[in-house]
């Protein structure tokens, strides 16, 4: 007789991963009977949503149900119907949306309110929308790269099933860049942390891991590109502002209003003698660099060392995997190379901030002017980040992994997320089981 | 659980200055605001002002502006708030409170007497 | 600045009775669909204790007894049946705009 395949019995979970700059969707799949091995989990589908960040609705909340149809209703086709009520379906918030809670819990709450009656109308399992913390979106960043990396498996191979494995067990460190904010987590080598805000033990199948991380909040690439703007702004002699950051023949008008809505900027706010300003930008990648390392404050250090703004940071140990906006930005400038050295990187830098704007435009005719104008200064301030902030060396670059999937998923907080939640990362060691039951019959 | 803890009383002569600390502990101090209010012997509750621990930014309302000044230590989770060129109507209980706009949270408060 | 009138002053109310108390502002603290008025409990010595946030929403761990209602300009706080733990003074609230302001507080006795 024919083998016949019988129904595949598998399960599905739902992340929706509400940043400062987009709202994303992730769609995750594994075999039912093999939840608590390692690797088993893989994302099947991303849907990235139409339109800005949740905590941009705030003067339109009745916006956010329609907002979010398209992918919920993507979600409904990828899972199969006999299987939408158990799907759980969870939302976190990043730092747009602790920044809102910053100014007004009311309006952060408003917002997410509404999400929550949104997402409760779909025929999945809800399981509510929540601010996550910093420290959760590092964490989970961590788990989420270790856990694709099969890092956390006691099984050694022989062969590599994905790429940067160095076939051993160390952990790799884990740098998130998003648009309010950067996350930055990895096991420290026999170092005391000495910060307990910035010190998580974890036990994942079977051992024990003392983790580093710190959010740094403002310091993603939106918010320090206006903390760069309210900081030059304050020195500009009229309302033309000079800046290195963007291509020569750049411009811009900016509502100093717009300037400082956000808290990020709070410490630059002062009277100005007027209401917009306009960017000229003149390309130059030394100057803009310079600039973004006043955003640094590198001169107070409560501790043995820091990164900067007095926050501990132990000496870098092993390999990172850097994701979200760091691996965009470098894909775009097409640096995510494990061959180009942080030298040539600077130097590509150099050569891209100092193009014209028309030839730019020119060059990258489909891209979004809002987008294009904005990576030189992302460029520049990864490189700022990673050098001074977290102290990477041009040694050391050659340890930065700049990761946008792993076998398929999504570099990302979300997968650990859902892992966590979902109680599918075992602190003991599973029991080896028998081979797994065959799925033809 | 979020907790609040102010310094003890200060009694102080006219035209001396006062800092008053706030240390913070259960929830992460770089996420809140941290505003600070103060009540005159039977009277009603006045706001003086806010920082933003992020980055140490600070608003305050006009009548203390220029006499008040509110820092912070992050790495101790603690605000402080520093009145100069004291009076004797600036004898008060003096109240750090978390919030954006929402002042859930309050300091036990810190009586600070102003006399000669 | 918006200034915010409460009335009454003191308010003597049997055990068991329903307690009332106004707040008026200036002008509207109503922003974003959302009505940034807020209602406080002060005892004696104590700290002042959130009891309503948002004009409606009940603040953590306050009995349900405790209701807060109005938008824009006029806002009313109601203990439906007030208890002997009740006696205290309640401060209404906003936080819509810069310099923030109280009422004049309401001093809610036993009759």
């Known amino acids: 007789t024919q083998n016949k395949a019988l129904p595949e019995n598998v399960k599905y979970g739902i992340v929706l991963d509400a940043g400062s700059s987009h709202t994303s969707l992730y769609i995750y799949k594994w075999p039912a009977e093999k939840e608590n091995d390692t690797g088993v989990v893989h994302q099947v589908e991303e849907c990235r949503v139409k339109g800005p960040g949740i905590s941009k609705f705030v003067q339109k909340v009745n916006e956010i149900g329609i907002y979010l149809t398209d992918c919920m209703e993507r979600a409904r086709e990828v899972i199969p119907r006999s299987q939408h009520q158990e799907t759980p379906v969870y939302l976190g918030a990043t730092a747009g949306m602790r920044l809102l809670r910053m100014e007004s819990e009311e309006l952060a709450d408003r917002v997410l309110d509404v999400v929550e009656r949104s997402l409760s109308n779909y025929p999945f399992d809800f399981q509510g929308a929540r601010i996550i913390t910093g420290q959760e979106e590092g964490a989970y960043g961590w788990i989420t790269i270790n856990y694709l990396l099969g890092k956390f498996s006691q099984k050694t191979r022989w062969f590599s099933i994905v790429p940067y494995e160095t076939n051993n067990q160390e952990t790799f460190g884990a740098l998130d860049l998003g648009g309010a904010s950067t996350q930055v987590t990895f096991v420290p080598q026999n170092q005391t942390i000495e910060s307990p805000d910035n010190a998580l033990q974890f036990r994942l199948y079977g051992k024990d891991y003392n983790v580093y991380t710190h959010s740094f909040l403002c310091y993603g690439k939106d918010q320090a590109l206006w903390q760069k703007l309210a900081k030059d702004i304050q020195v500009a002699s009229n309302e033309i502002l000079r800046d290195p950051c963007f291509h020569p023949g750049y411009k811009k008008v900016v509502n100093v209003s717009d300037l400082y809505k956000t808290p990020c900027t709070k410490r630059f706010e002062m009277t100005l003698p007027f209401q917009q300003f306009e960017i000229q930008g003149i390309g130059n990648y030394q100057q803009c660099h310079q600039s973004i390392l006043e955003l640094f404050n590198t001169s107070y250090c409560p501790y043995s060392q820091c990164a900067f703004n007095g926050i501990f940071l132990p000496p870098l140990q092993g390999d990172f995997g850097a994701f979200s906006a760091f691996y965009f930005v470098m894909k775009f400038l097409n640096l995510t190379s494990e061959k180009v050295s942080q030298e040539k990187v600077t130097e590509m830098m150099k050569k891209f901030c100092a193009q014209p704007w028309e030839e730019i435009k020119t060059s990258y005719a489909g891209v979004k002017e809002k987008y294009l104008s904005e990576y030189c200064f992302s460029g520049t301030y990864i490189l700022s980040l990673l050098l001074q902030g977290y102290h990477f060396t041009a040694d050391s670059w050659e340890h930065i992994h700049f990761i946008g999937k792993i076998q398929g998923s999504d570099a990302g907080w979300t997968l650990g997320y859902m892992l966590n939640l979902t109680n599918m990362i075992p602190a003991e060691q599973p029991l080896s089981t028998p081979l797994s039951h065959s799925t033809y019959v | 659980q979020v907790q609040l803890v102010q310094s003890g009383a200060e009694v102080k002569k006219p035209g001396a200055s006062v800092k008053v600390s706030c240390k913070a502990s259960?929830?992460?101090?770089?996420?809140?605001?941290m505003h600070w209010v103060r009540q005159a012997p039977g009277q009603r509750l006045e706001w003086m002002g806010y920082?933003?621990?992020?980055?140490?930014?600070?608003t305050f309302s006009q009548k203390f502006k220029g006499r008040a000044t509110i820092t912070v230590d992050t790495s101790a989770s603690t605000a402080y708030m520093e009145l100069s060129s004291l009076r004797s109507e600036d004898t008060a209980v003096y109240y750090c409170?978390?919030?954006?706009?929402?002042?859930?949270?309050w300091g036990q408060g810190t009586l600070v007497t102003v006399s000669s | 600045d918006i200034v915010m009138t409460q009335s009454p002053d003191s308010l003597a109310v049997s055990l068991g009775e329903r307690a009332t108390i106004n707040c008026r502002a200036s002008?509207?603290?109503?922003?974003?669909?959302?009505?940034?008025m807020y209602w406080f409990q002060q005892k004696p010595g104590q700290p002042p204790k959130l009891l309503i946030y948002?004009?409606?929403n009940q603040g953590s761990g306050v009995p349900d007894r405790f209701s807060g209602s109005g938008s824009g300009t006029d806002f009313t706080l109601t203990i439906s049946s007030l208890q002997a733990e009740d006696v205290a003074v309640y401060y209404c609230?906003?936080?819509?705009?810069?310099?923030?302001?109280f009422g004049g507080g309401t001093k809610v006795e036993i009759k």
């Open positions: 259960g929830y992460t101090f770089t996420d809140y605001n």
């Open positions: 920082i933003v621990p992020l980055n140490g930014g600070s």
């Open positions: 409170a978390r919030g954006g706009t929402r002042f859930a949270y």
């Open positions: 609230q906003q936080t819509k705009e810069v310099p923030y302001t």
């Open positions: 948002g004009a409606s």
């Open positions: 002008e509207s603290v109503d922003n974003f669909g959302v009505s940034f």
